[in-house]
Interface confidence: low
């Protein structure tokens, strides 16, 4: 018995179905086929879980969180024992193992391993200003999304005809910050933060209004 090499890693957007491949060759009839799928979740590597089991001609549910969402892609028994997971959740991310036994064929590699990463687009980011908006001050524009896998990067742009940040601005796309030093009237305007990752983007807007000093009355 020999389980074929798997693609190694699969990525899927949250809520979408995933297919985890596992096929094998065997010299024996599929009378005593026994297949177990296990997962070592990324979120809890110390607690491997059973996903689905095929034994004695019957299918058995694994961990409760997979109930109703998991099944074999084809009619069993078969040499293709790939499974699908519907409505993928973030907690489904992990390392999946298919373990195949088909007595009396007991030689060879009986395990296939596939990594599953459930991707999440960035949630609507939160934009805010830190610091005084008085002319000549330094301000920091902050942007962050609660969710996003892989971790989003953040791009700030000023919504004017140039889409460029003021020359005194420095941007950190990982942290989602823009520091604008020595703000002036020209710094005023609408700023947009674009949070993006491999499967989506999301934006927020921020209105920066630089406050000029009030003229003092004489006399």
């Amino acid at each position: 018995l020999e389980v074929s090499e798997s693609p190694g890693s699969i990525q899927v957007a949250r809520g979408q179905p995933a297919v985890l491949p596992c096929t094998f060759t065997t010299s024996a009839a599929l009378i005593n086929l026994n297949v177990i799928w296990m997962v070592t979740p990324l979120s809890n590597a110390n607690q491997p879980e059973q996903v689905i089991l095929y034994q004695g001609g019957q299918m058995f549910d694994g961990a409760p969180r997979f109930h109703g969402r998991v099944g074999f892609t084809g009619t069993m028994p078969a040499t293709n024992v790939s499974i699908f997971i519907n409505n993928t959740q973030l907690s489904d991310t992990g390392t999946y193992q298919c373990l195949v036994n088909n007595l009396p064929d007991i030689g060879g590699r009986n395990i296939g391993v596939t990594g599953l990463t459930v991707l999440v687009p960035p949630s609507a980011p939160h934009c805010q200003i830190q610091g005084s908006q008085d002319i000549g001050s330094d301000v920091i524009l902050l942007c962050s999304s609660e969710e996003g896998i892989p971790r989003p990067t953040y791009l700030w742009e000023k919504l004017d005809n140039t889409l460029k940040l003021p020359p005194t601005a420095t941007q950190d796309q990982v942290q989602g910050t823009v520091t604008i030093r020595n703000i002036s009237a020209l710094s005023s305007g609408l700023y947009q933060c674009v949070a993006s990752n491999a499967i989506g983007t999301s934006t927020c807007l921020l209105d920066l209004q630089v406050i000029s000093p009030q003229p003092r009355n004489i006399g």
Epitope: L53, G62, T95, G108, V113
Partner: antibody, heavy 121, light 108 residues
Framework: QVQLVESGGGVVQPGRSLRLSCAAS????????MHWVRQAPGKGLEWVAV????????YYADSVKGRFTISRDNSKNTLYLQMNSLRAEDTAVYYC??????????????WGQGTLVTVSS | ETTLTQSPGTLSLSPGERATLSCRAS???????LAWYQQKPGQAPRLLIY???SRATGIPDRFSGSGSGTDFTLTISRLEPEDFAVYYC?????????FGQGTKVEIK
Amino acid sequence: QVQLVESGGGVVQPGRSLRLSCAASGFTFSSYAMHWVRQAPGKGLEWVAVISYDGSNKYYADSVKGRFTISRDNSKNTLYLQMNSLRAEDTAVYYCARASPSQWLVLGHYWGQGTLVTVSS
Amino acid sequence: ETTLTQSPGTLSLSPGERATLSCRASQSVSSSYLAWYQQKPGQAPRLLIYGASSRATGIPDRFSGSGSGTDFTLTISRLEPEDFAVYYCQQYGSSPWTFGQGTKVEIK
């Protein structure tokens, strides 16, 4: 036939180190997870550690975490247990066991004869 | 960690009698993740039951497992002379894997 033979046990002083080996034969070693289980004299069984077939996943009992390291060399069909900072309470017969083919979390049918580790000053 | 408590500590019975061994978990164990082992003096343990009720290969059908949640039972329907030994339950649903303290089945 399946054989598991442990070696490396003996008498060692507290705080010292010891490395146990388990030589496997009669099956495709690289396809099976392997466990270490110990049994103190006259006491019950205590699971120590497990390693997945390719060595990518390892789990330990709290009592040995940070002191013991399970590893394997599939090219040599050998399982290892590196035991550091040994304590008197680590005195036990140490068994290696092959996981069940259908569930690698189950210790399975096949166990070695055990090797005795005595930690004493 | 999940603590398993076995009872009774010792069971004195005669060959041909029925043996009922109990294993209680401190927290719920998925029935897919409980095993029973037999150990005779000077020997390594032997897997009898896994998944709470699935007999391991080569295990006689006089051995049966049942239970779910926190209460599990190993039943030996008719004791044979070779069944007198120590029996351990073990959970493998959460790390660390843990064993019960054992039940000794001895000849009355």
